[in-house]
């Protein structure tokens, strides 16, 4: 969590952001609230990047001026308008690139003052895995999949009754590059399965971790998966 | 390679409505901006609006506002164009089109274009 | 909304002539950040879809005949062929993005 404070020689506001994560080609959010003021019409919202010359994004007078707009940004921005007189100033970033990572400015104008804070925005991709049995494998074998990471990821398998065991042996993992040439499919396969027992497939960048759980018995096959990015601070 | 390829000519009565259909290939639909031109016979070119199909946004010049209506299918990578409360003077040929991608904006340049769609308003 | 205004109408250019068509915006298209003018230039012929040949002003798309260029800056601009050829007989469209998009009303290249 960034909190900023206004500039000297006018009354400060509080500006609040978090950092963030975006997965690529999906739309993301930059987050940001600030002190509301009562008249939409006083309130100026500006984003910017560090190392961009024109802005992210500009709100002002109660609608978008995106005169000034890198032209990076053209098309992919939107504060959600309703919601800027309560205090949000947060940025919806569409199609979401690698290149969109880094240090933001989240400035703000009312009529109470001035203030910013910045929010460190890391972008890569990031999925859900999917952990199945391979009946076609010789043994029991269990496939974890995961279609799209970048950067590339670790993978991890562990087991509820065998805690703490290594499976780096008796596991394969491969990373098949995906048609748009940045992220990759994440494939692990895992051998040498007993029965009645839970297996976690655990895939991990600097942006996110997700965990693929499997439960094998006798009479059937439970799933669950989840996933957590890893670097949400407020600021 | 991109491609987007439209639907046949129509012939339509004043009054009616009108939905050109523009099927796109050879990238991801749902991140690109569709802009729809028309041109009317021997005229200019003229922006109508645009559709982005990933959320459904859309932005349209005041002069066809309350008149035509942009959507799009993502299962069918389709993007639509419907013109209601047709008049003679509505009779052109419809363009999609789509912007070259740049740092992944596309609201930008016209680099690819459907082989356009007459529309013919006559009673 | 932005009304682009472009002259001559029509123009007659003989063969490895210079031909010279002039594009004026109602408001200028600079980006006073990033110093880019938000304009670009299409070509169209007969029975075909435009097809774009400069962008923010100056910027030739990939593929297009170094004898296209763009100048201008603000609210004025020009499209110059250095060299008429045959294959650019063609109506010329300039258009506008800094708010939304404009086209301008064409101008039509023929040979003399």
């Known amino acids: 969590l960034i909190i900023g404070f206004g500039i000297s020689g006018r009354h400060s506001i509080t500006v609040t952001t978090v950092a963030s994560a975006g997965n690529i080609g999906e739309d993301g959010i930059l987050s940001c609230t600030f002190e509301p003021d009562i008249k939409l019409s006083d309130i100026v919202i500006q984003w910017l990047k560090e190392g961009v010359l024109g802005l992210v994004h500009e709100f002002k007078e109660g609608k978008d001026e995106l005169s000034e707009q890198d032209e990076m940004f053209r098309g992919r921005t939107a504060v959600f308008a309703d919601q800027v007189i309560v205090g949000n100033a947060s940025l919806r970033l569409k199609n979401v690139q690698l290149t969109d990572a880094g240090t933001y400015k989240c400035y703000i104008i009312t009529s109470k003052g001035k203030g910013n804070a910045n929010l460190e925005y890391k972008t890569g991709a990031f999925s859900m895995p999917e952990v199945n049995v391979d009946y076609n494998a010789s043994s029991e074998t269990l496939r974890c999949e995961a279609p799209r990471w970048f950067p590339q990821p670790t993978v991890v398998w562990a087991s509820q009754v065998d805690q703490g065991a290594n499976f780096s042996e008796v596991s394969n993992t491969s990373f098949e590059l995906n048609s748009e040439n940045v992220t990759m499919k994440v494939v692990s396969v895992l051998y040498n399965v007993t029965i009645n027992n839970t297996y976690s497939c655990m895939i991990e960048n600097d942006i996110a971790k997700a965990t693929g759980d499997i439960k094998v018995t006798e009479s059937e096959i439970k799933r669950r998966s989840h996933l957590q990015l890893l670097n949400s601070k407020a600021s | 390679e991109v491609q987007l390829v439209q639907s046949g000519a129509e012939v339509k009565k004043p009054g009616s409505s009108v939905k050109v259909s523009c099927k796109a290939s050879g990238y991801t639909f749902t991140t690109y901006w569709m802009q729809w031109v028309r041109q009317a016979p021997g005229q200019g070119l003229e922006w109508m609006g645009a559709i982005y199909p990933g959320d459904g946004d859309t932005r349209y010049t005041q002069k066809f506002k309350g008149r035509v209506t942009l959507t799009a299918d993502k299962s069918t990578s389709t993007a639509y164009m419907e013109l209601s409360s047709l008049r003679s003077e509505d009779t052109a040929v419809y363009y999609c089109?789509?912007?070259?991608?740049?740092?992944?904006?596309?609201?930008?340049?016209?680099?690819?274009w459907g082989q356009g769609t007459l529309v013919t308003v006559s009673s | 909304d932005i009304v682009m205004t472009q002259s001559p109408d029509s123009l007659a250019v003989s063969l490895g002539e210079r031909a010279t068509i002039n594009c004026k915006s109602s408001?200028?298209?600079?980006?006073?950040?990033?110093?880019?003018?938000?304009l670009a230039w299409y070509q169209q012929k007969p029975g075909q879809p435009p097809k774009v040949l400069i962008y923010?002003?100056?910027s030739r798309e990939s593929g297009v005949p170094d004898r296209f260029s763009g100048s201008g800056s603000g609210t004025d601009f020009t499209l110059t062929i250095s060299s008429l050829q045959a294959e650019d007989v063609a109506v010329y469209y300039c258009?506008?993005?800094?708010?939304?998009?404009?086209f301008g009303g064409g101008t039509k290249v023929e040979i003399k």
């Open positions: 923010w002003a100056s």
């Open positions: 258009k506008q993005s800094y708010n939304l998009y404009t």
């Open positions: 408001q200028s298209l600079l980006n006073s950040r990033t110093r880019k003018s938000y």
């Open positions: 089109a789509r912007g070259r991608d740049y740092s992944g904006s596309s609201w930008t340049w016209f680099a690819y």
